[in-house]
Interface confidence: low
Amino acid sequence: MALPTARPLLGSCGTPALGSLLFLLFSLGWVQPSRTLAGETGQEAAPLDGVLANPPNISSLSPRQLLGFPCAEVSGLSTERVRELAVALAQKNVKLSTEQLRCLAHRLSEPPEDLDALPLDLLLFLNPDAFSGPQACTRFFSRITKANVDLLPRGAPERQRLLPAALACWGVRGSLLSEADVRALGGLACDLPGRFVAESAEVLLPRLVSCPGPLDQDQQEAARAALQGGGPPYGPPSTWSVSTMDALRGLLPVLGQPIIRSIPQGIVAAWRQRSSRDPSWRQPERTILRPRFRREVEKTACPSGKKAREIDESLIFYKKWELEACVDAALLATQMDRVNAIPFTYEQLDVLKHKLDELYPQGYPESVIQHLGYLFLKMSPEDIRKWNVTSLETLKALLEVNKGHEMSPQVATLIDRFVKGRGQLDKDTLDTLTAFYPGYLCSLSPEELSSVPPSSIWAVRPQDLDTCDPRQLDVLYPKARLAFQNMNGSEYFVKIQSFLGGAPTEDLKALSQQNVSMDLATFMKLRTDAVLPLTVAEVQKLLGPHVEGLKAEERHRPVRDWILRQRQDDLDTLGLGLQGGIPNGYLVLDLSMQEALSGTPCLLGPGPVLTVLALLLASTLA
């Protein structure tokens, strides 16, 4: 629609002409109110009703009416009229878009005298060269300080020309700034290159903390170096407190590994625990990742400059949604070995696990599994069942993570997957498993133990058998006998000793001929049915000097049951005062039927068991 022919917008007394009003209708965009802007600011463009009937002057229009003018409609106005519009917009505090501000600035070709009357943010779009005198530039940049520099992106030409002009205006030479200089620069201080950060860290770092956008690479490196240097205002990282961490909040993503490692660890922990409870650190609900990472959770874009280029300590300061948005799953997979050295929270580990789950829905490759570290504790048995773990090094690495804790369902599943994959419990595997879980062998069923090859028995230590029951030792003993068969007597006994709970009578008899000096603890673990047939002489030879220990054990199995089977005069030869043997003239009947039924041998002798008096009188025998 064409603009009305040139007529003054306002009459001399401030009464607008009809043509001017029509212009306003178009120039203020009432035909097409700016929905975008209304949505962003919460302001709405007003309807047209009543404006034609009672035409107002610009200053009498409400903010809602002034809201959305298209640039094209301003281009035909004189500089004076544009100035009047700009002043009205300032008076009504109307929030303008970047395009509208740029448009107005472009039409204000001459430098305005009354800068204070113009919208503050409009100044950002004016050419600073137009305010070259010392007074003019001071007035201009004093106002700019209060403007929202971040309306302009870092790379925008209007923003790039402001900083050098401001530095020149304030008379800054070199890179050394005073506190007053930083204050005078306002939001432009966030654009100062790294050399300023390096030379003026004391006054500049506290300002950079509150810069809304991310710092560029040059600034980050300079800030990192300054913080690591330990100069004022924060001092050496080793002396930082929780309040220092709070003060540094905006610079935390800049910290590198050496700085983080130097901060008192208790301080990092305390600060992070506190900030995790601080609502101001939480993202609005719509972007929070639910614990189970439901598919419908809205994906949030990674903030500019936060994309992770490597897995390092700076990530501990990322919120959960930032980790989700800014860490590439493939990068994580290739640098998994670093995760274990970084103190992520449990919640952050959940996010990392979720990323790996998405990357490897069929199960993780072994290259990733080997470096899971503490992330392994986040895995469920269901996750682990998808894995194909073949390397003993991988198994060791994951068992190391759970070291010192009970065997968890995850570990049990991992071991099961590994052993099934190998087909049998070979020596190296057994060695590894028993090193981490001494009771592992005794947790297997006799059927499972039958798959252990004799060669693996070399890896078993005495403590690995502490919790094994006789049924398990019955399976393991023949394998041990086979494994150690080529050893000489004393060496053989040392190795076979802890397996003897599965040894038969004939093997115990054979051992008694070899001066082995079995200790009482081993004797007490022997099978009762294997001990009962041994003679007093055989037991004496078997135990050697340890035979004296029988007295202390005479009430306990298998010693108690063995005593009941021996002739009292034979027991007396030991000189230990063992009581309960069969007196001379008594007969022992082996009621094997009753033994089979009751599971215990039936001894016919004095004491609590059935006895039969044979009364073998010498005369009768004669």
Partner: antibody, heavy 130, light 109 residues
Framework: QVQLVESGGGVVQPGRSLRLSCAAS????????MGWVRQAPGKCLEWVAV????????YYAEAVKGRFTISRDNSKNTLYLQMNSLRAEDTAVYYC??????FGSGSYYPLYYYYAMDVWGQGTTVTVSS | EIVLTQSPGTLSLSPGERATLSCRAS???????LAWYQQKPGQAPRLLIY???IRATGIPDRFSGSGSGTDFTLTISRLEPEDFAVYYC??????????FGCGTKVEIK
């Protein structure tokens, strides 16, 4: 089993140098931070230096900073302490120790980033005397 | 620098008795970063407790640790003959990276 064996100790004159070694076995050496702790005769334990598992971070006690250098060779499962400009007050038994990966007690924050020393060698004696 | 002060310097007790050892820090130490070690003559130290209260692998349950902030305690509920030794506390959570207390000697009365 897990074992650390120190070597390289001996009698040395003030101002001279000595290099201690610590051979590790029975665990994945490259996964653990390692350190040196010393104990002068009849005195308390004194931390000397630590090195991170991948050798990128090294930290020293003030008393040895600038004179001692901690290093490691993960391919050889060996930790080293190069001691230069030795002084009489450096006389002590030097223990090699492993930083164990332990959980802290908080449920929110797994504090496995910083460690206590969970495995120690038997020590090697360094005597600095003229 | 955090200084750890252990008291008493020497504790004379009989087997079967309860031992209570104190470790006081010059400034607050996160309980997650306090450890206790046992050292017998001619031997290397042995880790007993880390995280102020968590027993290291293989340590009998008669040993227990407690405390937070600046005051920490190691308790041996019933002294066994093998428990007579020197006990050190250590913080590993602030700069310098580690500091040890000067020890409490538990001797047979």
């Amino acid at each position: 089993q897990v074992q650390l064996v120190e070597s390289g100790g001996g009698v040395v004159q003030p101002g001279r140098s000595l290099r201690l070694s610590c051979a590790a076995s029975g665990f994945t050496f490259s996964s653990y931070g390692m350190g040196w702790v010393r104990q002068a005769p009849g005195k308390c334990l004194e931390w000397v230096a630590v090195i991170s598992y991948e050798a990128s971070n090294k930290y020293y006690a003030e008393a040895v900073k600038g004179r001692f250098t901690i290093s490691r060779d993960n391919s050889k499962n060996t930790l080293y302490l190069q001691m230069n400009s030795l002084r009489a007050e450096d006389t002590a038994v030097y223990y090699c120790a492993r930083e164990g990966a332990h959980f802290g007690s908080g449920s929110y924050y797994p504090l496995y980033y910083y460690y206590a020393m969970d495995v120690w060698g038997q020590g090697t004696t360094v005597t600095v005397s003229s | 620098e955090i200084v750890l002060t252990q008291s008493p310097g020497t504790l004379s007790l009989s087997p079967g008795e309860r031992a209570t050892l104190s470790c006081r820090a010059s400034q607050s130490v996160s309980s997650s970063y306090l450890a206790w070690y046992q050292q017998k003559p001619g031997q290397a130290p042995r880790l007993l407790i880390y995280g102020a209260s968590i027993r290291a692998t293989g340590i009998p349950d008669r040993f227990s640790g407690s405390g937070s902030g600046t005051d920490f305690t190691l308790t041996i509920s019933r002294l066994e003959p093998e428990d007579f030794a020197v006990y050190y506390c250590q913080q590993y959570g602030s700069s310098p990276i580690f500091t040890f207390g000067c020890g409490t000697k538990v001797e047979i009365k």
